[in-house]
Interface confidence: low
């Protein structure tokens, strides 16, 4: 740009573009100032006057330099299956993340739209793949010699205890029962737990004034090429 052109609005040289934090206004045919994050264009520029910016109203925001006539609405309050990890400010949207024990069942480019409870494997089935922030638990049948007697999203199949004398043989959903003599080998007391996934993906929640109710998880599993894991339960 020529040295004398310093202030907006100005007509750009043919074939050139406007500078950083400026935009080309088609109506005025001038390079004009953008509004800073937290603001929006209250009055668009003309050939003789620059853009007039104004602060975003409560519950609205702009995250980028912009020339939008209205700020974007912040998403509604986080629903019962989420926690708010970032408040709505003039410069950023509210961010909701799925709470522990839930995962993002329907994602968006900028976060999560729907959280769903992690699948729980019923007795006779254990966790084959733990849930993550964006994927559900995968259950598998307990192999011979192992069992799971819980309904859990974290418990894996555990080996049957080995008895000197077996009173009742174990099966997929029950440990072996020994006679009064102590077993030769057993797992540590209690079930083996996998760590709960920590959700970090943000959610731009539905831009509505009311908090959403947590939808039933049965709605939320994508129809992929393979059927759902056998032995899984909705909740």
């Amino acid at each position: 740009l020529p040295a004398q052109v310093a202030f907006t609005p100005y007509a750009p040289e043919p074939g050139s573009t406007c500078r950083l934090r400026e935009y080309y206004d088609q109506t005025a045919q001038m390079c004009c100032s953008k509004c800073s994050p937290g603001q929006h264009a209250k009055v668009f520029c003309t050939k003789t006057s620059d853009t007039v910016c104004d602060s975003c109203e409560d519950s609205t925001y702009t995250q980028l330099w912009n020339w939008v006539p209205e700020c974007l609405s912040c998403g509604s309050r986080c629903s019962s299956d989420q926690v708010e990890t970032q408040a709505c400010t003039r410069e950023q949207n509210r961010i909701c993340t799925c709470r522990p024990g839930w995962y993002c069942a329907l994602s968006k480019q900028e976060g999560c739209r729907l959280c769903a409870p992690l699948r729980k494997c019923r007795p006779g089935f254990g966790v084959a793949r733990p849930g993550t922030e964006t994927s559900d638990v995968v259950c598998k049948p307990c192999a011979p010699g192992t069992f799971s007697n819980t309904t859990s999203s974290t418990d894996i199949c555990r080996p049957h205890q080995i008895c000197n004398v077996v009173a009742i043989p174990g099966n997929a959903s029950m440990d072996a029962v020994c006679t009064s003599t102590s077993p030769t080998r057993s797992m540590a007391p209690g079930a083996v737990h996998l760590p709960q996934p920590v959700s970090t993906r943000s959610q731009h929640t539905q831009p509505t004034p009311e908090p959403s109710t947590a939808p039933s998880t049965s709605f939320l599993l994508p129809m992929g090429p393979s059927p759902p894991a056998e032995g899984s339960t909705g909740d």
């Epitope: 974007l72 480019q109 509505t208 109710t213 939808p215 599993l221 129809m223 992929g224």
Partner: antibody
């Protein structure tokens, strides 16, 4: 100009298969949720299924197992594969794009729509 | 399975009349509701999205309201070009759903 054009409709016998195409222009198909909707003669709109930006497909309960939605990003084309067709599948099939307003890639409403392609299942 | 119930299924009205169409969701869908207009032989046209927001190029005589489960489309002063069929559509849940559209309301000339 944003435009959707369906093709591939026609007459097919019961039990047969058909693949419909929806050619998109003026935007990148992979950036939007895309849906298929059908309308039997003289009837209302009936949702078939949707594919999201991540490539996951979701189907109406009646369409699961028989209908498959896919897309070819290199051709900017959406597809609907229909198998085991029945007389009651006779309809005009529309593809439509999620509006993706206000910087959201998902809006839950559809615009524009294609002109539709007629599928007739009859022996 | 969220179901969308529209009423009435048809309405007879005259030019200038105020017409109200209701749509009820069987579950809370917040504001994820759209309204469409369809004329014979044509594809549907988006009128309202997110329950109350007017789509681009749609006349201001069309308005939408409601949230949760009960929604309304109002045409404040019916014009000749408004005689058509209107559909509501939920955009909240796509899994285990039979149809995301309501059954439709035909607005006919009285």
């Amino acid at each position: 100009e944003v435009q959707l054009v369906e093709s591939g409709g026609g007459l097919v016998q019961p039990g047969g298969s058909l693949r419909l195409s929806c050619a998109a222009s003026g935007f990148s198909l992979s950036d939007y949720f895309m849906t298929w909707v059908r309308q039997a003669p003289g009837k209302g709109l009936e949702w078939v299924g949707i594919i999201n930006t991540g490539g996951d497909s979701y189907y109406a309960t009646w369409a699961k197992g028989r209908f498959t939605i896919s897309r070819d990003n290199s051709k900017n084309t959406l597809y609907l594969q229909m198998n085991s067709l029945r007389a009651e599948d006779t309809a005009v099939y529309y593809c439509a794009r999620d509006t993706g307003y206000g910087g959201y890639d998902y809006a839950g409403s559809f615009d524009p729509w294609g002109q539709g392609t007629l599928v007739t299942v009859s022996s | 399975d969220i179901q969308m119930t529209q009423s009435p299924s048809s309405v007879s009205a005259s030019v200038g009349d105020r017409v109200t169409i209701t749509c009820q969701a069987s579950e809370n869908i917040n504001s994820w509701l759209a309204w469409y207009q369809q004329k014979p032989g044509k594809a549907p046209k988006l009128l309202i999205y997110e329950a109350s927001k007017l789509a681009s190029g749609v006349p201001s005589r069309f308005s939408g309201s409601g949230s949760g489960t009960d929604f309304t489309l109002t045409i404040s002063s019916l014009q000749p070009e408004d005689f058509a069929t209107y559909y509501c559509q939920q955009g909240y849940i796509y899994i285990d759903v039979g149809n995301i559209f309501g059954g439709g309301t035909k607005v006919e000339i009285k």
